[in-house]
């Protein structure tokens, strides 16, 4: 988004030391990887691995990097222009309706149903009725496990922040 060189473009030894890089705001805004000073005169770089900003902004502070929860794996680290990307561990998934936690994938489909989709970090296994082919959603009935699945292969992040 910005032609300026930002912190994640630099090799680790080149990244800003404790004193942060400053530049001038453009039309009252600072570029990704920076925040604006309280007096509005300077753009101050975010601290690599600690905080970030993803767009042009007038933030007085960069945003704190997300720390992946236990039960999550870090797909990519936090840079000055991008938040950490976390993904549910193998065998668990994050639903859109409850993004704050990873839930265990079901191990099989209810009786009379067949598995048509694997467990992925962003979805449970998918089951359909053998005859009608209609999807099954909701809680697993007490009698199940006629079809077992192996955990899906992670392919892309389930939640991108920034």
């Amino acid at each position: 988004e910005s032609a300026l060189i930002t912190q994640q473009d630099l090799a680790p030894q080149q990244r800003a030391a404790p004193q942060q890089k400053r530049s001038s705001p453009s039309e009252g805004l600072c570029p990704p990887g920076h925040h604006i000073s309280e007096d509005g005169r300077d753009c101050i770089s975010c601290k690599y691995g600690q905080d970030y900003s993803t767009h042009w902004n007038d933030l007085l502070f960069c945003l704190r990097c997300t720390r992946c929860d236990s039960g999550e794996v870090e797909l990519s680290p936090c840079t000055t222009t991008r938040n950490t990307v976390c993904q549910c561990e193998e065998g668990t998934f994050r639903e859109e309706d409850s993004p704050e936690m990873c839930r265990k994938c079901r191990t099989g489909c209810p009786r009379g149903m067949v598995k048509v989709g694997d467990c992925t970090p962003w979805s449970d296994i998918e089951c359909v009725h053998k005859e009608s082919g209609t999807k099954h959603s909701g809680e697993v009935p007490a009698v199940e496990e006629t079809v077992t699945s192996s955990p899906g292969t992670p392919a892309s992040p389930c939640s991108l922040s920034g």
Epitope: T54, H55, N57, D58, L59, L60, F61, L63, R64, T66, N83, E96, D97, S98, P99, E100, S159, L160, S161, G162
Partner: nanobody, 126 residues
């Protein structure tokens, strides 16, 4: 139930200005970041701007930087987008949106937002 109602759209000439409003029915409006997105005909919905929950500090897409200003009145549960120096490429349906639970401090991607208004059409033409 979360309800978001945008208003203020209309037809304007290039270089003109408009102010969009978005009224929210939800009490958590005052503790949530909120954003504006737009969708031009035949194109994907894209991020325009988002503002922090307390109404101080915002993100802007590079395409609107310096021309659009987002603001938020928590007491009135209303979000605003002041648009100036409008261009033909700003023509789109503009949506306000509230994020899903558990997203980042200032979400800026479509998938991070779970509650959307019906949109208001902005047309910029000579």
């Amino acid at each position: 139930e979360v309800q978001l109602l945008e208003s203020g759209g209309g037809e304007v000439q290039p270089g003109g200005s408009l102010r969009l409003s978005c009224a929210a029915s939800v009490s958590t409006f005052g503790t949530s970041p909120v954003g504006w997105f737009r969708q031009a005909p035949g194109k994907e919905r894209e991020f325009v701007s988002a503002i922090r929950w307390e109404g101080v500090g915002a993100y802007y897409a590079e395409s609107v930087k310096g021309r659009f200003t987002i603001s938020k009145d928590n007491a009135k549960r209303t979000l605003y987008l002041q648009m100036s120096s409008l261009r033909a490429e700003d023509t789109a349906v503009y949506y306000c949106a509230l994020p899903r639970r558990g997203e980042s401090e200032l979400p800026s991607t479509v998938k991070e937002y779970g509650y959307w208004g019906q949109g208001t059409l902005v047309t910029v033409k000579p």
